[in-house]
Interface confidence: low
Amino acid sequence: SLGSLTIAEPAMIAECKTRTEVFEISRRLIDRTNANFLVWPPCVEVQRCSGCCNNRNVQCRPTQVQLRPVQVRKIEIVRKKPIFKKATVTLEDHLACKCETVAAARPVT
């Protein structure tokens, strides 16, 4: 109704900036040759650029990034028993963002 429209708060643009996102630590980042293991934790928080730009010809993109090595557990299953090992995964955090012009996408043929 009209009444409910008048009390609704004004929409605020989700500006292009770094935000906390969840990054899944896939097993292939640890070991591409073996699938017989688990990774703990399965996901972590990273800083990533997201948000809107003022037109379709620009996208929110990182202008500065930093790599962050983190230690995870690689849990191998050997004869139905877990063997705990350590592995390092390098995460990419976005430090700064900018609305940048995007080249026209090539159509898939």
Partner: antibody, heavy 126, light 107 residues
């Protein structure tokens, strides 16, 4: 044989434009992040730009931001560097290079550049 | 930006000598440090990645060490083909940066 072959270098006046190309062969180009590195006459190496395997992440050195644009065509196995508003200080040999390893384009550059082209010379002079 | 400082800028050595080149980062870069060799008129060649990992095909006389801000490239027994310029490069954060180079010359 894994190979990168740059082309497009030329003599150009200050303020002019140039597009460099880097043709890749002998490896799965679409799986690897790529880079441009330059070397001014008698000087050291300077990183210019990096682009992830899918082209979604592109980074530039401060000295070229806003003037140079890096792009790639994974269908043509070719990397490009569009250089606009060229300055005398952009005079250099420009190399394209492959980041190693290629399997993870999210953290694509932390193990260095393992394959390099022979370089193409860009001279900016009036 | 992270500054990379190499020393010495040049050195003279003889075949068989043990040569050490150092590289210092302006802030901690963990182990994200690579070493390259470049000969005149040629493209650089990756020698060491991740501070201490030997790139495939590189002779074992080359070794790298260090973490944080201080790194070292060592050539255990200098060979005639090793006379070249060596560069360190950080890959911890963009913009990626190189050291100024160390020219290894024949004594």
């Amino acid at each position: 044989e894994v190979q990168l072959l740059e082309s497009g270098g030329d003599l150009v006046q200050p303020g002019g434009s140039l597009r460099l190309s880097c043709a890749a062969s002998g490896f799965t180009f679409r799986s690897y992040a790529m880079s441009w590195v330059r070397q001014a006459p008698g000087k050291g190496l300077e990183w210019v730009s990096g682009i992830s395997a899918g082209g979604g992440y592109i980074y530039y050195a401060d000295s070229v931001t806003g003037r140079f644009t890096s792009s790639r065509d994974n269908y043509k196995n070719t990397l490009y560097l569009q250089m606009n508003r060229l300055r005398v200080e952009d005079t250099a040999v420009y190399y394209c290079a492959r980041f190693y390893p290629g399997y993870n384009s999210d953290t694509y550059y932390y193990d260095g550049m393992d394959v390099w082209g022979q370089g193409t010379t860009v001279t900016v002079s009036s | 930006d992270i500054q990379m400082t190499q020393s010495p800028s040049s050195l003279s050595a003889s075949v068989g000598d043990r040569v050490t080149i150092t590289c210092r980062a302006s802030q901690s870069i963990s182990s994200y440090l690579n070493w390259y060799q470049q000969k005149p008129g040629k493209a650089p060649k990756l020698l060491i990645y991740a501070a201490s990992s030997l790139q495939s095909g590189v002779p074992s006389r080359f070794s790298g060490s260090g973490s944080g801000t201080d790194f070292t490239l060592t050539i255990s027994s200098l060979q005639p083909e090793d006379f070249a310029t060596y560069y360190c490069q950080q890959s911890y954060s963009t913009p990626l940066t190189f050291g100024g180079g160390t020219k290894v010359e024949i004594k």
